[in-house]
């Protein structure tokens, strides 16, 4: 399911339950997709001791995941709201071509590698509904994208097992560092 | 486990940088958060580091307390430091792996004594 | 800004005695609430997180309960080694605030 549990409009088994600010369904989206991802790196690193690896000794790819610094406005210093929903935006649109490689890549969780794509779908239209400025966002180009695609998945067994333990674990961070700036707004 | 090291005895004023290392595992993977108690009184956190440059500080630490991180020990720098800065200073570890900050790893401490 | 309020200050108890301590946030922190047992001269140790999951090698004689506001930390029946200083701390946001613990409870032999 894109959405957490009891956040569907059309869910009437608690009618007495106040309905969620925007901000309350976007706090709650991103942590259901955490827990998400929590599942898809359980199997990632039962298959692999890619995980207990240091980031230094991964730090070696040439993926170009987005990653949120300073100059993004998300950090306690130098906190800017406007900043930093342009780059949250940005950087969750340019995360789903790795969501996509994602698919397939999973045996016993391919059902929840599904989840988080769709679910974070749903969270950049949440976002993109508090956003002022969309004109900042740029949206990835369709074919870059698709070019990407068909060479993260040409590489090689091992390869792919470290890209895919990269995107998720790049993701997280990613989502953990939004999570906390999206609630200092 | 996570050793802490540099509390001595300081006269007002005087910077100080107290370091945090880990031993068994590498400080990459992780978040670290310090923490200090003043004699017979309660914890208060200072601040914490996520990634390589990301970091929280409390709003009284702000501007006076600086905490950086390499892959085998995180350092808390303090600058103008007075009396009521003297207690024992933690190091603990988060292992990230979720969205809420809880620190499951301590150090046993380091004195930092602050007098004239 | 959050803050967390602990009470009592302090309570006396027996062995065997059933203890509560109770945690207020200022605003919702969903169960994103931990608490820690710190002995004298020793580094605090975390008890539960969540709000109400068990850390590791804790004794099932303590438990958590609570969301949103209000927090509960129990243990059923106070041991010999129970006696020492509880803190709760919020884990929920970080920034723009002047404390995550909440001021302590010290639990003293009656």
């Known amino acids: 399911a894109p959405v957490p549990p009891g956040e569907d409009s059309k869910d009437v088994a608690a009618p007495h339950r106040q309905p969620l600010t925007s901000s309350e369904r976007i706090d709650k989206q991103i942590r259901y997709i955490l827990d998400g991802i929590s599942a898809l790196r359980k199997e990632t690193c039962n298959k692999s001791n890619m995980c207990e690896s240091s980031k230094e000794a991964l730090a070696e790819n040439n993926l170009n995941l987005p990653k949120m610094a300073e100059k993004d406005g998300c950090f306690q210093s130098g906190f800017n709201e406007e900043t930093c929903l342009v780059k949250i935006i940005t950087g969750l649109l340019e995360f789903e071509v790795y969501l996509e490689y994602l698919q397939n890549r999973f045996e016993s969780s391919e059902e929840q590698a599904r989840a988080v794509q769709m679910s974070t779908k749903v969270l950049i239209q949440f976002l993109q509904k508090k956003a002022k400025n969309l004109d900042a966002i740029t949206t990835p180009d369709p074919t870059t994208n698709a070019s990407l695609l068909t060479k993260l998945q040409a590489q090689n067994q091992w390869l792919q097992d470290m890209t895919t333990h990269l995107i998720l674990r790049s993701f997280k961070e990613f989502l953990q560092s939004s999570l906390r700036a999206l609630r200092q707004m | 486990s996570l050793e802490e090291s540099g509390g001595r005895l300081v006269t007002p004023g005087t910077p100080l940088t107290l370091t945090c290392t880990a031993s068994g595992f590498s400080l990459s993977n992780y978040y670290v958060t310090w923490v200090r108690q003043a004699p017979g009184k309660g914890l208060e956190w200072i601040g914490i580091i996520y990634g390589s440059d990301e970091t929280a500080y409390a709003t009284w630490a702000i501007g006076r307390f600086t905490i950086s991180k390499t892959s085998t020990t995180v350092d808390l720098k303090m600058t103008s430091l007075t009396a009521a800065d003297t207690a024992t200073y933690f190091c603990a570890r988060d292992d990230s792996s979720d969205w809420d900050a809880k620190f499951n790893l301590w150090g046993q401490g380091t004195l930092v004594t602050v007098s004239s | 800004a959050i803050q967390m309020t602990q009470s009592p200050s302090s309570l006396s108890a027996s062995v065997g005695d059933r203890v509560t301590i109770t945690c207020q946030a200022s605003q919702s922190i969903n169960n994103e609430l931990s608490w820690y047992q710190q002995k004298p001269g020793k580094a605090p140790k975390l008890l539960i997180y969540r709000a109400s999951t068990l850390a590791s090698g804790v004794p099932s004689r303590f438990s958590g309960s609570g969301s949103g506001t209000d927090f509960t930390l129990t243990i059923s029946s106070l041991q010999p080694d129970d006696f020492a200083t509880y803190y709760c701390?919020?884990?929920?946001?970080?920034?723009?605030?002047?404390?995550?613990f909440g001021g302590g409870t010290k639990v003293e032999i009656k």
């Open positions: 701390q919020q884990g929920y946001s970080l920034r723009n605030i002047d404390n995550a």
